[in-house]
Every structure is written in structure tokens, then in C-alpha cells.
């Protein structure tokens, strides 16, 4: 079951998933000037059996200028620099990932992929929050959000995190102990997360839903 809305926005914070539940989809998005190859899948899908999970399909991008070719275009110096940054980040993300049954790791980057990754999360997915550079984390409980199914609808739990002040950035789970507290949080206003929304509003009783597409920005 796909989660219908996006994880909560926390001011001056970004989120990431340490691992992706089976059923998660990742759009095959290409950077400007490139497009998905004609025979290519529109998304990667986290699938698996009892012992192993992996991403089905591979994303491939080709130059929009190229007509009937699937040849990978050599990136220009600017693009190479951008791609290297993405690779480095991906490797860093993989380094702190544990192998969870029924979960896939962060997929490695593909040639000429877009700078934003658009994930479609499923019920049971957990995402973790950290404050952006220059903001300090005030924990009032777990700095995480879980997609749950209740009331016939999906929702994300509220992460117990506030990002404040000018100081060192906080860390992801395992690198800092949050202080637990039962208090709730006020609604957050803005976020550096890039999100695109695709509204599918149904106002009938049993289906008052909104569908959002999730995007996390590479920092």
C-alpha cells in the first residue's frame, strides 16, 4: 500500500530513509537535456524474497538530442563534477546502512540522473530527520516518521524534532542519542526538502485522500 502524502516537513531539516521497504518505487528521472531510454522502465521497484531484496529494473538516461540511440553521452566537466558528488553521497549513504530483511538499500546513481530522487514510499516505511547545516537539533523524542495505515488512510507520524540556532549540524540515527519526551510538536512551516505534489482529490466519504509524490533533495 503506497503512502498517500509526504513525510512531515520540519523547518530547517531534511529526511532520508536508511533502507527502503519492498514495494517502494523510485522514478527514473533524468537531468535536463536527457530523457529515459525508450525501452527503459519508468521506475525502479524494491522487490525481494525471504532472504534478499533488490531493485528491479535499471534506470537509463540518454541525450534528448539523440534520436534512435541508447548510447550514454559522456558528461561535460560540470556534469562530471555533479555526478561525482552524487556518487560520493551515495557511497556515504550506503556506508551507514544495515541490511534489513525486506528492505533495499539506496540505489547507486545512474548516468545523467536528475538531482532529485522521487520515491513512492509504502506503509511501514521509516524516514529519519536531521537538521541542515548550521542548525542544532532539539529532540523531544525520536527524530523519525513512520508511514502508518489507520482510518482507511495512510499518514506519517510526527517526528519529535526541532531545528534551531546557528551551530553544528546534527547527525542521523546511531550517531546521536535523542532525548525522549511525550510532548507533541507544533506544525512546521517550511523545509528545504524539495517536494512535488500530484493531487488526486476524492471527496467521497471513504476516500478523502490526497496523493503526493515524495522527493528528497541531495544535499
Amino acid at each position: 500500500e503506497l503512502c498517500d502524502d509526504d513525510p512531515p516537513k520540519i523547518t530547517h531539516a531534511t529526511f532520508k530513509a536508511v533502507a527502503y521497504k519492498e514495494g517502494t518505487m523510485l522514478n527514473c528521472e533524468c537531468k535536463r537535456g536527457f530523457r529515459r531510454i525508450k525501452s527503459g522502465s519508468p521506475y525502479m521497484l524494491c522487490t525481494g524474497n525471504s532472504s534478499h531484496s533488490s531493485w528491479d529494473n535499471q534506470c537509463q538516461c540518454t541525450s534528448s538530442a539523440a534520436r534512435n540511440t541508447t548510447k550514454q553521452v559522456t558528461p561535460q566537466p560540470e556534469e562530471q563534477k555533479e555526478r561525482k558528488t552524487t556518487e560520493m553521497q551515495s557511497q556515504m549513504q550506503l556506508a551507514d546502512q544495515v541490511s534489513l530483511p525486506g528492505h533495499c538499500r539506496e540505489p547507486p546513481p545512474w548516468e545523467n540522473e536528475a538531482t532529485e530522487r522521487i520515491y513512492h514510499f509504502v506503509v511501514g516505511q521509516t524516514v529519519y530527520y536531521q537538521c541542515v547545516q548550521g542548525y542544532r537539533a532539539l529532540h523531544r523524542g525520536p527524530a523519525e516518521s513512520v508511514c502508518k495505515m489507520t482510518h482507511g488512510k495512510t499518514r506519517w507520524t510526527q517526528p519529535q524534532l526541532i531545528c534551531t540556532g546557528e551551530t553544528e549540524p546534527s547527525q542521523f540515527p546511531g550517531e546521536e542519542e535523542p532525548q525522549a519526551s511525550p510532548d507533541g510538536l507544533p506544525e512546521s512551516e517550511t523545509s528545504r526538502l524539495v517536494t512535488t505534489t500530484d493531487f488526486r482529490i476524492q471527496t467521497e466519504v471513504a476516500a478523502t485522500m490526497e496523493t503526493f509524490i515524495f522527493t528528497t533533495e541531495y544535499q
Epitope: 489507520t150 482507511g152 482529490i201 478523502t208
Partner: antibody, heavy 120, light 107 residues
Framework: QVQLQQSGPGLVKPSQTLSLTCAVS??????????WNWIRQSPSRGLEWLGR?????????DYAVSVKSRISINLDTSKDQFSLQLNPVTPEDTAVYYC??????????WGQGTLVTVSS | EIVMTQSPATLSVSPGERATLSCRAS??????LAWYQQKPGQAPRLLIY???TRATGIPARFSGSGSGTEFTLTISSLQSEDFAVYFC?????????FGQGTRLEIK
């Protein structure tokens, strides 16, 4: 501390409109992490959920099938109030009516309850 | 709609003893189940949500268990203030439903 304070008449004539209001303090009705509900309780029906209103970038209402054609839940965000209208009513609508907050888990805060008698 | 059935309708237990109340759903409600306590003239009070999580301020003698269609509320050592009516409620479906209640009385 969240509090829900109910108000409204305790006696309504058959075929007329039952109207109750629930004033919220300690929270906002526009809180995206909660839904605002009406529930009633009678010896014959037990506890019966009637409907909810909630905000998810716009306002939504969900109504129980048993009362869908007769119920309306409205909001006054400036006063942090929500209200119940049930029209028309019959003696079978005689019950104690409660408003309650639901943070998408269970009803954690309830109003004090209002006994509404439908009788001519 | 999901029908919630509680048993027994009335349970007689002596103070200090353990009370076990059951709730069955007509179809799976996952762990989306709550328990309430109600005393005469009062609104229901939330005891347990998510099948097994105690609400704020609820004593540790109250515990919930189960998932899917079978659920249990256990009161480990009954206090005089625990004698009341107990309701289960599912919130898995968009249309919320309650059980008919179990009256817990002093034996």
C-alpha cells in the same frame, strides 16, 4: 492541556435540527495531526461514531453511513470550534452526544457529553 | 462495516485479582485497536491504543495485546476504581466502530 467544551440544547423536537458545538482549547482544529469527531451513546446503540472533520491542505468530512444523509459537521477556525447538525431527528436519536479529538490513533480527549432528548 | 464483539458481557472479579477482557473484530484491523474505560456519568477514557500502547497517565496494571482480529485487555491486579465498563474500538477502517462493552463488577 487539551480541553473540549460542548454546548447546545438538551431537548429537540422530532423533525427538527439537533445542533451542538464543541469548543477546543489547547489545540487548533486546523492541526493536521488530528481529526475532530462526534460520537453518541445510547442504551440501544451503544457507542456510535457519527463523523469527523479534519484538515489535510483542505477540509474534509467523513460521515457514518447510518447518518450520512442527515448529518453535517461544520467548523469555525477563528474560534477553534466545530459543530454537529443532525436533521431531521427522530426519538431514536435520543442519546448522549460527545465530541472528541483523534490524533489519527484513538480518541484521546473527549467533551463532557450532552444528553439530547428528542421528544415533542 | 467492521463489527467488534466483546466478551464476556459482564465479568465479576474480586479486588486484587486479574481481569481479562476479550475483543474480536469481524475482519483484520491490524493493530489499530483502542480500549476505553467508562464510569457512570462520564465520557470514556482512553486506556490503550495501537493494541498495546498505554495512553498517558494510565497505570502499568493495564495492558493490551493482540493483532488482526483477536485482542485482550488485562488488568493485572484490580483496584476499586477499576470497576467500570470497558469498550474496544477499531480505527483501521475509515468508519470507526466500537464493541458493545464489558461490565467489570466486584465479585
Amino acid at each position: 492541556q487539551v480541553q473540549l467544551q460542548q454546548s447546545g440544547p438538551g431537548l429537540v423536537k422530532p423533525s427538527q435540527t439537533l445542533s451542538l458545538t464543541c469548543a477546543v482549547s489547547g489545540d487548533r482544529v486546523s492541526n493536521i495531526n488530528a481529526a475532530w469527531n462526534w460520537i453518541r451513546q445510547s442504551p440501544s446503540r451503544g457507542l456510535e461514531w457519527l463523523g469527523r472533520t479534519y484538515y489535510r491542505s483542505k477540509w474534509y468530512n467523513d460521515y457514518a453511513v447510518s447518518v450520512k444523509s442527515r448529518i453535517s459537521i461544520n467548523l469555525d477556525t477563528s474560534k477553534d470550534q466545530f459543530s454537529l447538525q443532525l436533521n431531521p431527528v427522530t426519538p431514536e436519536d435520543t442519546a448522549v452526544y460527545y465530541c472528541a479529538r483523534d490524533p489519527w490513533e484513538a480518541f484521546d480527549y473527549w467533551g463532557q457529553g450532552t444528553l439530547v432528548t428528542v421528544s415533542s | 462495516e467492521i463489527v467488534m464483539t466483546q466478551s464476556p458481557a459482564t465479568l465479576s472479579v474480586s479486588p486484587g485479582e486479574r481481569a481479562t477482557l476479550s475483543c474480536r473484530a469481524s475482519q483484520s484491523v491490524s493493530s489499530n485497536l483502542a480500549w476505553y474505560q467508562q464510569k457512570p456519568g462520564q465520557a470514556p477514557r482512553l486506556l490503550i491504543y495501537a493494541a498495546s500502547t498505554r495512553a498517558t497517565g494510565i497505570p502499568a496494571r493495564f495492558s493490551g495485546s493482540g493483532s488482526g482480529t483477536e485482542f485482550t485487555l488485562t488488568i493485572s491486579s484490580l483496584q476499586s476504581e477499576d470497576f467500570a465498563v470497558y469498550f474496544c474500538q477499531q480505527y483501521n477502517d475509515w468508519s470507526i466502530t466500537f464493541g458493545q462493552g464489558t461490565r467489570l463488577e466486584i465479585k
